[in-house]
């Protein structure tokens, strides 16, 4: 056959289905690889054909289109599975074709087990909340072409395995569920399940996400350096280790990246002569505020290396703060004994 | 001396991915981000994005979110960047270049010739 | 996106003339805290990556000529090569690095009159 424009496996869409559900799945190549739709291709003549490999299976085989009630259908650019069975997984592929032009991708497709508490293998989408914010809603993902508008489905929400009534601050309002206000103790995992009638037969489709509870952009604040501070003075001597931790807290911040770093002398560590170290930790809270500690290092320290000015800086969404550490020499104690012996005129 | 190394020339077809990566010495590599930009023939420069070789974190130009992966190997130094879905309009030198968070980038690679051809 | 307009496109400039580039950013790229201005200048010759010159907008990088400056504050920015020699033959580019996605301007061709 003529060639074909191959754009490969897509793992970028890693899509994962329930077993005994109804799933539509688009023909990736109208959405990422080519830059015209469905209807355009249609209309100039392209066919777009279907088939799949199965799991640990090297062969391409065409899809069955002809089984009971219908179970694949293809509907333009969308493959349709009512219900998917666990066998259904593989690598499927969508061909667009005529006699002068081909184009085609594949992509992976996973049929997952759940349990009667929605477990499973899913990789679960994660909706966050802010703390003590006013209402705030989730919707249920992924539904939109299954069933016509006319239709009107039934939506049962839970909260990990527990239906969801009768919740002080969470109301089921159909697609939506609302948090009337948002506590760390709803955090966790929400299904939604949606049910519907078609063609005599009655389908579900079960939808979970994860809900994490975040700091208010109401009670953000820049970066504050806890340390460098003016309390702490780094007195050393000539030899010793330096060791100055530069300790941040940066509030929660959607899409924010927060960053710390140091400066030397105005100058990037690097481009000091010396052998400077820096190690970083991070730790969270239950609000997802972050505090981050940079601990500059210099394992022998010089008389020179003490006059330097040691500077940590932060930044995020939020602005940019710095603040420079106190280092001093160590003065060296008197010697009491010669000192006194000479106050009193000894030789 | 400080110095990026990046690998050989490559040739692909539309849709095919490229791995390319670059190799750092003379450095902390951890301590500075690293960048990938590009150059179209006769064109300007266009950054595609940066990863935190200490943290792994990455903040990718939205033209490329959905295309480029950016990963990093801190046991050998080395940063990597690969580009799928490509189309003839991605042949371009790519270069890897670093910067000390907001002091510019200092040292570039070689930069790497990849051309995008059925 | 921050655009970076730089302006001219080309320049030719006689040997030990003043060269002076350009560059507008579509929004402000100073850090208030900090009073520093995101902005980097770098000078590209053909079949070479480019090399750092400038770096918040004033700082030249360790090892550049003393004969490149910049200047400007917010939105507007210049390069400046006071007396410009045979080697300044190259393309040099702007970018602000204040927000990702970090943009360049299109660049400014500086050749000998």
């Known amino acids: 056959s003529e060639r074909c424009d191959d754009w490969g496996l897509d793992t970028m869409r890693q899509i994962q289905v329930f077993e005994d559900e109804p799933a539509r799945i688009k023909c990736p190549l109208f959405e990422h690889f080519l830059k015209f739709n469905y209807s355009t291709a249609h209309s100039a003549g392209l066919t777009l054909i279907w088939y799949w490999t199965r799991q640990d299976r090297d062969l391409e085989e065409p899809i069955n289109f002809r089984l009971p009630e219908n179970r694949i259908s293809k509907e333009k650019d969308v493959l349709w599975f009512r219900p998917t069975l666990l066998n259904d997984t593989g690598n499927y592929t969508c061909m667009l074709r005529n006699t002068t032009y081909c184009s085609k991708v594949a992509f992976p497709l996973e049929v997952v087990q759940k349990d009667s508490c929605f477990n499973s293998p899913m990789k679960l989408p994660v909706h966050k909340l802010y703390i003590e914010y006013g209402i705030q809603r989730i919707t249920c993902p992924n539904v939109d072409g299954y069933f016509p508008s006319s239709v009107k489905p039934t939506i049962t929400w839970y909260m990990g395995c527990y239906k969801i009534q009768n919740f002080n601050n969470v109301i089921p309002e159909g697609m939506n569920l609302s948090f009337l206000i948002a506590f760390i103790s709803n955090n966790g995992n929400y299904t939604c399940v949606v049910t519907y009638p078609e063609n005599g037969r009655t389908f579900h489709l079960t939808r979970t996400l994860t809900v994490k509870v975040v700091g208010s952009p109401k009670n953000a604040v820049p970066p504050v350096i806890h340390s460098p501070n003016d309390h702490v003075v780094y007195e050393k001597e000539p030899g010793e280790e330096l060791l100055i931790p530069c300790t941040v807290y940066f509030s929660f911040l959607m899409d924010s990246r927060n960053e710390v770093w140091w400066t030397i002398d105005g100058k990037k560590p690097d481009d000091i002569p010396i052998d400077v170290t820096i190690n970083e930790s991070i730790s969270h809270s239950r609000t997802e505020d972050e505090t981050r500690t940079q601990i500059l290092s210099i394992k022998k320290v010089t008389s020179e290396d003490l006059k330097r000015s040691y500077v940590c800086h932060a930044r995020s969404a939020k602005g940019e703060v710095a603040k420079a550490a106190t280092v001093k020499q160590k003065v060296p104690a008197p010697r009491y004994t010669v000192e006194l012996a000479c106050g009193f005129g000894a030789t | 001396q400080v110095q990026l190394v990046q690998s050989g020339a490559e040739v692909k077809r539309p849709g095919a991915s490229v791995k390319v990566s670059c190799k750092a010495s003379?450095?902390?590599?951890?301590?500075?981000?690293m960048h990938w930009v590009r150059q179209a023939p006769g064109q300007g420069l266009e950054w595609m994005g940066w990863?935190?070789?200490?943290?792994?974190?990455?903040d990718y130009a939205q033209k490329f979110q959905d295309r480029v992966t950016m990963t990093r190997d801190t046991s050998i130094s080395t940063a990597y960047m690969e580009l799928s879905r490509l189309r003839s309009d991605d042949t371009a030198v790519y270069y890897c270049a670093r910067s000390y968070y907001y002091y510019g980038m200092d040292v570039w690679g070689q930069g790497i010739t990849v051309t995008v051809s059925s | 996106d921050i655009v970076m307009t730089q302006s001219p496109d080309s320049l030719a400039v006689s040997l030990g003339e003043r060269a002076t580039i350009n560059c507008k950013s579509s929004q402000n790229i100073i850090n208030s805290s900090t009073n520093k201005n995101y902005l980097a200048w770098y000078k590209q010759k053909p079949g070479q990556p480019p090399k750092l010159l400038i770096y918040?907008?004033?700082t030249r990088e360790s090892g550049v000529p003393d004969r490149f400056s910049g200047s400007g504050s917010g939105t507007d920015f210049t390069l400046t090569i006071s007396s410009l020699q045979a080697e300044d033959v190259a393309v040099y580019y702007c970018?602000?690095?204040?927000?990702?996605?970090?943009?360049f301007g299109g660049g400014t061709k500086v050749e000998i009159k």
């Open positions: 990863i935190n070789p200490y943290s792994g974190g990455t």
């Open positions: 003379g450095y902390t590599f951890t301590g500075y981000y």
């Open positions: 918040w907008a004033s």
């Open positions: 970018q602000q690095y204040y927000s990702t996605p970090f943009t």
